[in-house]
């Protein structure tokens, strides 16, 4: 768990406290909330970031239509239970013993139950659709330029392997970024698409998680790309298990950014 050794900080996670008391006398950065040591050479897991956040003093259809099994994060923030590696535990419970199952990005994928609820495994979210609406501009962005810039962003800022950015769709003013990563495709050391999507979401909101870096300044051929609305859909390797009542009254949670 190394970090910038000269001043012992965590470039990839400002929600940490760092001290020179790690193995071998190296700098060790602990995530707020959990106290788990994080690897500052890569993104911190979404579970640890959420825990830290909760502990902090607070026409030609080129666009993808999410499938009926797509999940959106309707429940908002909660203080999650993370496993020893910092991943979401399959079962989450609140203080009043209400429990539910989540996927690998921490989004609820079952109806809520009691302490007897079983979540046998952590189901992987293998497809993430990031749906953005940009502010009006003089003209539409060039699709290939936009595609290249967003791919560069995920590769350089979030260290996500290019093969996991499946597609970038554009139909002014809507941009869609598709991230795909099956269990079999994810090798040791690969950034998880769920973590990359969460860092991107926080960047878009002007809440960058990176230490000391300026906020996200997205430009396409010098033209600022300003996002006014994001909506993220999560698709799991195994479809979610909601009651029919829930499926027929599925309220999408929209993130508005101004």
């Amino acid at each position: 768990h190394t970090a910038a050794q000269d001043n012992c900080t965590c470039p990839t996670n400002k929600m940490t406290v760092c001290s020179p008391d790690g193995p071998g006398g190296r700098c060790q950065c602990r995530a707020l909330g959990s106290g788990m040591a994080v690897d500052c050479s890569t993104l911190t897991s979404k579970c640890l970031l959420l825990k830290a956040r909760m502990s902090a003093p607070k026409n030609a259809r080129t666009l993808v239509r999410p499938s009926e099994h797509a999940l959106v994060d309707n429940d908002g923030l909660y203080d999650p239970d993370c496993d020893p590696e910092g991943r979401f535990k399959a079962r989450q419970c609140n203080q009043t013993s209400v429990c539910w199952c989540v996927n690998s990005v921490g989004v609820r994928r079952t109806d809520k139950g009691d302490l007897s609820l079983r979540c046998d495994e952590l189901v992987r979210t293998h497809h993430i659709l990031i749906d953005l609406r940009h502010r009006p501009t003089a003209g539409a962005f060039n699709h290939s330029d936009l595609d290249a810039e967003l791919r560069r962003l995920f590769r350089e800022r979030y260290r996500l392997h290019p093969k996991f950015v499946a597609a970038v769709h554009y139909e002014q003013p809507t941009i869609q970024i598709e991230l795909r990563q099956n269990t079999s495709q994810k090798a040791a050391g690969d950034v998880d698409i769920g973590d990359a999507a969460y860092y991107f979401e926080r960047d878009i909101k002007g809440e960058s998680l990176f230490q000391g870096r300026g906020g996200l300044d997205l430009r396409v051929r010098g033209e600022p790309l300003q996002v006014e609305r994001t909506l993220i859909y999560y698709l799991d390797e195994i479809p979610p298990k909601f009651s029919m009542k829930r499926l027929t009254h599925h309220h999408h949670h929209h993130h508005h950014h101004h």
């Epitope: 001290s19 707020l32 106290g35 020893p84």
Partner: antibody, heavy 115, light 107 residues
Framework: QVQLVQSGAEVKKPGASVKVSCKAS????????IHWVRQAPGQGLEWIGT????????VYNQKFRDRATMTRDRSISTAYIELSRLRSDDTAVYYC????????WGQGTTVTVSS | EIVLTQSPATLSLSPGERATLSCRAS??????IHWFQQKPGGAPRLLIK???ESISGIPSRFSGSGSGTDFTLTISSLEPEDFAVYYC?????????FGQGTKLEIK
């Protein structure tokens, strides 16, 4: 050389509060966690919590969250723990220790709670 | 919270013998375990950090091993001053916890 020197023994009545100090020297006080640990007579070691002196970020063992307060004064390289609403079972030796692996310890402060 | 279980509770050996003390964690904690010796009336003293890293000033007869959930402190040849209580402690995540201790006594 690194040293942690604690304040002297205290005798308190139930319901009172006690504040123990831990003065650090021989290293950069702000860069290492200070932990508080207690040991009741004949018992094992119990972690109360920790504070990071640089920014005063503190973490408490759930058991002590409502009664313990950890603070620090960077100007005199001293950490403090205050325990309120004392009970007889708070009678113990209270230690401060440095870093995640507790490489240096204070000499201990005996707190006796008795009516 | 992570529970550390030490065994045996008491270990009776003679000077010159080899002592093997065990500490088991309730979940995977990597190598975030540290070992302490405590004598009556004194503060604990760090012997080993991060499962196997030696500490300056600690005799080489003290060594540590293990990772994940099972950890061992070994004293290769007991000296009379080694008879004391030994604790393991983890620093994987908050709250930090200690094992209940192993008392090493003279047989």
């Amino acid at each position: 050389q690194v040293q942690l020197v604690q304040s002297g023994a205290e005798v308190k009545k139930p319901g009172a509060s006690v504040k123990v100090s831990c003065k650090a020297s021989g290293y950069s006080f702000t860069t290492h966690w200070i932990h508080w640990v207690r040991q009741a007579p004949g018992q094992g070691l119990e972690w109360i919590g920790t504070i990071f002196p640089s920014n005063a970020y503190a973490v408490y063992n759930q058991k002590f969250r409502d009664r313990a307060t950890m603070t620090r004064d960077r100007s005199i390289s001293t950490a403090y723990i205050e325990l309120s609403r004392l009970r007889s079972d708070d009678t113990a030796v209270y230690y401060c220790a440095r870093a995640s692996y507790f490489d240096y310890w204070g000499q201990g402060t005996t707190v006796t709670v008795s009516s | 919270e992570i529970v550390l279980t030490q065994s045996p509770a008491t270990l009776s050996l003679s000077p010159g013998e080899r002592a093997t003390l065990s500490c088991r964690a309730s979940q995977n904690i990597g190598t975030s375990i540290h070992w302490f010796q405590q004598k009556p009336g004194g503060a604990p003293r760090l012997l080993i950090k991060y499962a196997s890293e030696s500490i300056s000033g600690i005799p080489s007869r003290f060594s540590g091993s293990g990772s994940g959930t099972d950890f061992t402190l070994t004293i290769s040849s007991l000296e009379p001053e080694d008879f004391a209580v030994y604790y393991c402690q983890h620093s994987h995540s908050w709250p930090f916890t200690f094992g209940q201790g192993t008392k090493l006594e003279i047989k």
